[in-house]
């Protein structure tokens, strides 16, 4: 029996019944047996046949068998309902080896001329699969030429067996107080040869609930306790299963932190498998009652290890642990069934004993000593010589803990002492240099060192002078020593205020003229302003109807009298406000120089002499009295004058203070 | 205005017990609304708090100083006193009284400075 | 035991901000209160509860608190502002306080 030609040489040929293309002899027997290499199969095709027709092939035929298997028994020339010829069909081996015979009998009725076949090897798609039968891989199946391999999805790995897919499923680690868990592909049928663990880890002093849930189906066998698949659940404490079957375990309390499900498949079986449902409890903590003015967020039934709350207080209450404030409390349930922290206190707001007022008061509305939440105080200040500045002095203590004004401001508010208050009283005439009274110049205030100047009081801490009364002492402001509250100049008796600061016009050039002679002093501490300290005003913008020609204001000082020495006791003179022009022509003449009077200055004094400022009262103010508010302002600082003061057709010179209105608010407000 | 005023001896010896006393004025020490604190400030270095005391005798201490420290208060005299057992030269400060409103410090006393040498 | 970080020393020029910082674990959960003492004196608050500024206190000096770091703000800094400055927090009821901060005014 030829064979066919054996590999890796190309495997294919042609078969022929002996004689071929001429008719076959009877009781001829030929086999012919084809080997393919391993992975491929054996193709055979007919391109002629013509063999004896005979009741089930029974005299001639042609047989085609693989294995141990026939895969056709051929004759006649067409296929008959009882006998098979081979027409256009093709043949496939079943494995590797295909054997072909022929015989014919021991005689025909007419001659056939029998057959010919062609062959050849091709490549087994071991990928394909007849219905209804095993694929031959469990995911991914791959053919190549003489062979095949099976690959897996992510999350699987082949098992040794080459075909089969297990399950990547250990390793596991639920963390959450609460959880899911299932078989490989749940609610699908779970994978062979597997063996799954999943690990629950929760903290210490929680226990893990198991509920099975949904379906369970796992192999099982009705003898042996679960031989082929199961579910075993392992706890520091005990084991649970191992559990297979349609029937959903019951609930499981582990009373442990701790629990590792094992799942283990074998290689057959169709089943969906399990799901778990997972919570866990511990130990509840004490419920949280609120404190009062509080309440607790977030409201539970019970709270258990890792739970916290917060305490919210009501407007008006804050947070206390003991007498320190929180900003925020939140507790949390410990293992041991205790709160890490003590309940705090809503404790209402105190906005404490209110700040002193200084040249001022202050009265409690609500109650004697009542500081808290809500509580209304009254500031006010010391009546004739201090105003309230801005607002009512009503105070409420809010929920910030401050106490606060109607128009929401926190800071204290300001005793501004009253000004332009003089126990003088204008006669409007003119007449003689004359001696002050108690009360009557209270802003008078006398400034040594070196020279002997006047100023005037501004506020409470404030000096409006000459700048070239303080021009030498701007670097050195210490040591100026400013005197008030006094009406002589040598008396013991007397308010001492220092200074903290000089403030010279910037416009002002020391011994070039008197344009911008304006300065203030800062005093280094507040004075206390009684009916002998009391500030002059600054000249509100409708003052200019107060200073006209002619109208009276009034010059006091210390400064050199007729008899040309200092003036023991403070002396003051009423005089006019003189035109402007005519001033200005008084002082054009030698030896005056030209533009000695500018629009900065203002002019007092009588045309015929005698009533005047002069050495010594130099910073001093020249005051009006403003009939509509009863209240005396600042309309000029004396400056300069005539060499002889009082002289005739002279007049005395006054720094025009309306016009440094501006200057004087920034130098107050920026220092 | 309440002001504070620390009084005691400026010298101690090593291992002796430093007392000091702290004298309220301008204001009630018996007063719901303020506890009363001791704090020390070693030469040329920071403020250490070593603890605070309420009216009715309730107390707070620094826990690196507690097993040292006691803090009592008198009322009738307005005072309230610190005492610092087995003292070392690490304890020598200045020591200042403050009221203490719901956790901050105002006003402070003027200090005092006490050396521990023998 | 809970500690307060500030850096030892800085300097500002006369009118310029400056911001003293104070760092410690979660210090934005707790209130802050910074002192300022300047030589020979007594501390003095300054702020109170982060950012609360106690009468007398001027508007220039500002607080702010939040994660791991408290800040103290002096905007338009004057040469008076030159001291040392002392944040504080409470921490599990015992007080603590910062090494403190050296401000300079240039």
């Known amino acids: 029996t030829p064979l066919g030609p054996k590999w890796p040489e190309p495997v294919f040929g042609r078969l022929a019944s002996p004689g071929f293309p001429g008719e076959y002899a009877n009781d001829q027997e030929r086999r012919w047996t084809l080997t393919a290499p391993p992975g491929y199969r054996l193709r055979l095709y007919f391109t002629h046949f013509d063999l004896e027709l005979s009741h089930l092939c029974e005299y001639d035929f042609v047989k085609l068998s693989s294995g141990a298997k026939v895969l056709a028994t051929l004759c006649g020339q067409e296929s008959t309902d009882t006998e098979r010829a081979p027409g256009k069909d093709t043949f496939y081996s079943l494995g590797s080896s295909l054997d072909i015979t022929f015989r014919s009998d021991y005689s025909n009725e007419k001659p056939f001329t029998g057959f010919e076949a062609f062959y050849a090897a091709e490549d087994i798609d071991e990928c394909q699969v007849a219905p209804g039968e095993a694929p031959t891989c469990d995911h991914h199946c791959h053919n190549h030429l003489g062979g095949f391999y099976c690959s897996c999805r992510a999350g699987y790995v082949l098992h040794r067996n080459k075909r089969t897919c297990s399950a990547l499923c250990s390793g596991q680690v639920f963390t959450q107080r609460s959880g899911e868990l299932s078989s490989p592909e749940y609610p699908r049928p779970y994978p062979k040869l597997s063996s799954c663990t999943y690990s629950i880890s929760l903290e210490e002093g929680f226990s893990v609930i198991l509920d099975f849930v949904e379906s369970f189906d796992v192999e099982t066998h009705p003898e042996t306790l679960c031989p082929y698949d199961f579910l075993k659940i392992q706890t520091d404490r005990e084991e649970h299963g191992p559990f297979c079957g349609k029937t959903l375990p019951h609930r499981i309390e582990t009373k442990s932190n701790t629990v590792t499900i094992t799942f283990v498949t074998d290689e057959s079986g169709d089943h969906t498998g399990w799901k778990i449902h997972y919570t866990s409890t511990a130990q509840p903590c004490p419920y949280p009652m609120a404190p009062p003015n509080g309440h607790v967020s977030p409201v539970q039934a019970k709270y258990i290890l890792k739970d916290s709350f917060s305490i919210f207080c009501e407007t008006g209450y804050e947070l206390l642990q003991g007498h320190l404030p929180l900003k925020s409390f939140t507790a949390v349930c410990q293992k041991d069934g205790s709160w890490d922290r003590p309940m705090p206190a809503c404790s209402i707001v105190d906005c404490g004993p209110p700040d002193d007022l200084p040249s001022g008061r202050v009265e409690y509305i609500t109650g004697p000593g009542v500081t808290t939440y809500k509580a209304v105080i009254q500031y006010s200040c010391e009546e004739t010589f201090y105003t309230m500045k801005v607002n009512d002095g009503k105070y409420v203590c809010e929920a910030d803990g401050f106490w606060t004004s109607s128009k929401g401001e926190k800071s204290l508010p300001v005793c501004e002492p009253v000004c332009g208050l003089s126990a003088r009283t204008t006669g409007g005439r003119i007449y003689g240099g004359q001696k002050a009274k108690p009360g009557d110049f209270p802003w008078q205030v006398l400034i040594l060192g070196g020279t002997t100047a006047a100023g005037a009081l501004l506020y409470d801490n404030w000096v409006l002078t000459a700048a070239h009364a303080v021009y030498e002492q701007k670097h050195d402001a210490s040591a100026l020593d400013i005197r008030m509250g006094t009406l002589k100049r040598l008396s013991p008796h007397y308010t001492q205020a220092w200074s903290e600061a000089v403030f010279i016009h910037e416009g002002y050039t020391h011994d070039a003229g008197f344009d911008n002679d304006i300065a203030l002093i800062k005093l280094n501490n507040k004075v206390v302003i009684n009916s002998n300290i009391t500030p002059i005003c600054l000249p509100r913008k409708e003052a200019e109807s107060f200073m006209r020609t002619d109208d009276i204001g009034t010059a006091s000082g210390w400064g050199l009298t007729q008899r040309g020495f200092l003036a023991r006791n403070l002396m003051y003179v009423d005089i006019p406000i003189v035109d402007h022009q005519k001033c200005t022509a008084a002082y054009e003449k030698p030896p005056y120089p030209r533009g000695s009077v500018t629009a900065n200055m203002l002019c007092a004094g009588l045309e015929s002499g005698g009533k005047d400022s002069c050495r010594g009262d130099s910073g001093g103010a020249l005051v009006f009295l403003d009939s509509e508010t009863e209240r005396w302002f600042v309309g000029g600082i004396v400056s300069w004058g005539s060499m002889n003061c009082g002289e005739a057709g002279q007049y005395g010179v006054y720094t025009k203070v309306i016009n440094y209105i501006p200057w004087i608010e920034n130098i107050i407000s920026d220092f | 205005q309440v002001q504070l005023q620390e009084s005691g001896p400026g010298l101690v010896k090593p291992s002796e017990t430093l007392s000091l006393t702290c004298t309220v004025s301008?204001?009630?020490?018996?007063?719901?609304?303020?506890?009363w604190g001791w704090i020390r400030q070693p030469p040329g270095k920071g403020l250490e708090w070593i603890g605070s005391i309420y009216y009715s005798g309730s107390t707070y201490y620094n826990p690196s100083l507690k097993s040292r420290v006691t803090i009592s208060v008198d009322t009738s005299k307005n005072q309230f006193s610190l005492k610092l057992s087995s003292v070392t030269a690490a304890d020598t400060a200045v020591y200042y009284c403050?009221?203490?409103?719901?956790?901050?410090?105002?006003?402070w006393g003027q200090g005092t400075m006490v050396t521990v040498s023998s | 035991s809970y500690e307060l970080m500030q850096p030892p020393s800085m300097s500002v020029s006369p009118g310029q901000t400056a911001s003293i910082t104070c760092s410690g674990d979660k210090l934005g959960d707790i209130y802050a209160y910074w002192y300022q003492q300047k030589p020979g004196q007594s501390p003095v608050l300054v702020i109170y509860?982060?950012?609360k500024r106690p009468s007398g206190i001027p508007e220039r000096f500002s607080g702010s608190n939040s994660g791991n770091t408290a800040t103290l703000t002096i905007s338009g800094t004057q040469a008076m502002d030159e001291a040392d400055y002392y944040c504080q927090a409470w921490e599990s009821s015992t007080g603590v306080f910062g090494g403190g901060t050296k401000l300079t005014v240039l």
């Open positions: 509860q982060d950012n």
């Open positions: 403050a009221r203490d409103r719901r956790g901050r410090f105002d006003p």
């Open positions: 301008g204001g009630s020490i018996s007063s719901s609304s303020y506890y």
